[in-house]
């Protein structure tokens, strides 16, 4: 007769583990019973459980309350046992020893493997501001039995660097991701992708990416100077910026106070019908945590009637 | 041929505890059992514990948790530690090993140690 088993069982932490030791014998052999140890290198056999064809199931107080025969119906020649929960520490090399009547004893070895699904965890790096160089956005650190693999799903440009650490019994793997932060990048999504054979599918932590910055700052509504004339109504400014954090404006009048009336709404700045005091240098000054930016217009309010009579003088003049 | 010779029987109130030895002589072979059987005043043989070389163990479901058995294999020694005895308990114990036999289990058998629970 001969022995069936596995070289190798794999189980996730916290599954059951069968270990198969099945005699095929000639017919009249039977088995008497079928020892399991456990055989690491390096250390005596540590008895696991005993199947006795009279006694039945003889487990170690090592593991009292794990070892159990499969469900029936069973048969007599399978000396097969099912190690309840598996746990990292279970790893190892294990020896089943048959021993049968009128054939003696037979021996076979397997390898039993706990994978060991890694918890990943996603660490945002330092703020990042348009114009730092190469900067850490995150990083992602996975640990496991075997080591997962740990890598970036992004359509952000950037470089990745990774480092491993071994345990006894498992490995750690740290992959950083670094990148030049623009504005552009603001609001994409970075996201670490972990995989190991211990999972059904990889694991994704995804990262919104946030980049500080702020625009240069410009001012709209003077496009057509001769809009800009005494009596105009609704004439405002508006002050053109953006960035992140989202930024906040503040209006003030270089050559003195704010002229009455004008009213400061935000980015926009909102004149009462026009006469000449509203005149002047106005300064939209744009600032967030990130920066500051200033921007300012001079605004010269046309007296139409003295406007044609510069023309006719003008005209007098030729 | 095995020679067994049981010791510790004798009377103990309800609750109370024994332990029993049974000292192991002869031809033992390397993956003998040895264990324990009782018979109660008029009823039949009944299986009670055996435990493996290794220290594996086995129980019957009346005694698990109040019984527990060990050995010795430098001194080819067999013990049963009872603990929470009832009425139910008296018994004649008998110490057996177990062989390897031609085509199956051959069972040597001691003379027996009576324990007796009343109060």
């Known amino acids: 007769g001969e022995l069936e088993t596995s070289d190798v069982v794999t189980v996730v932490l916290g599954q059951d583990a069968k270990l198969p030791c099945f005699y095929r014998g000639d017919s009249g052999e039977q088995v008497g019973q079928v020892a399991w140890a456990r055989v690491d290198a390096g250390e005596g056999a540590q008895e696991l459980a005993l199947l006795h064809s009279k006694y039945g199931l003889h487990v170690s107080p090592a593991y009292e309350g794990r070892v159990e025969q499969p469900p029936p119906p069973r048969n007599p020649l399978d000396g097969s046992v099912l190690l309840r929960n598996a746990v990292q520490a279970d790893e190892g090399e294990y020896e089943c020893r048959v021993s049968t009547f009128p054939a003696g004893s037979f021996q076979a070895r397997l390898r039993l493997r706990v994978l060991v699904p890694p918890l990943p965890s996603l660490n945002p790096g330092p703020a990042l501001e348009e114009g730092q160089g190469l900067t850490l956005a995150a990083s992602c650190t996975a640990e496991g039995s075997p080591a997962p693999s740990v890598t970036w799903d992004t359509e952000v440009k950037g470089t990745t660097s990774s480092r491993s650490f071994k345990h006894s019994r498992s490995a750690a793997v740290t992959s950083e991701f670094h990148l030049v932060p623009s504005r552009s990048m603001n609001g994409q999504p970075l996201t670490c992708v972990v995989s190991h054979p211990g999972l059904l599918q990889d694991q994704r932590i995804t990262h919104i990416l946030h980049v500080s910055f702020l625009a240069e700052a410009s001012v709209r509504g003077l496009e057509d100077q001769n809009l800009w004339h005494i009596g105009r109504e609704g004439a405002m400014l508006k002050c053109l910026s953006e960035g992140q954090p989202p930024p906040s404006y503040n209006w003030t009048r270089l050559d003195g106070p704010l002229p009455s009336g004008v009213r400061v709404d935000g980015d926009t700045l909102g004149f009462p019908p026009l006469t000449t005091e509203h005149s002047g240098i106005y300064v939209c000054h744009v600032s967030n945590e990130f920066s500051s930016r200033d921007s300012q217009v001079t605004v010269d309010v046309l007296d139409p009637q003295e406007d044609s009579g510069k023309q006719v003088d003008l005209v007098s003049a030729s | 041929e095995v020679q067994l010779v049981e010791s510790g029987g004798g009377l103990v109130q309800p609750g109370g505890s024994l332990r029993l030895s049974c000292a192991a002589s002869?031809?033992?072979?390397?993956?003998?059992?040895m264990g324990w059987h009782r018979q109660a005043p008029g009823k039949g043989l009944e299986w009670v514990a055996t435990?493996?070389?290794?220290?594996?163990?086995n129980y019957a479901d009346s005694v698990k948790g109040r019984f527990t058995i060990s050995r010795d294999n430098s001194k080819n020694t067999l013990y049963l530690q009872m603990n929470s005895l009832r009425a139910e308990d008296t018994a004649a114990y008998y110490c057996?090993?177990?062989?390897?036999?031609?085509?199956?289990?051959?069972?040597?058998w001691g003379q027996g140690t009576l324990v007796t629970v009343s109060s």
């Open positions: 002869g031809s033992i072979s390397s993956i003998n059992l």
């Open positions: 435990i493996t070389r290794g220290g594996s163990t």
């Open positions: 057996v090993d177990v062989e390897p036999s031609g085509m199956g289990w051959r069972d040597y």
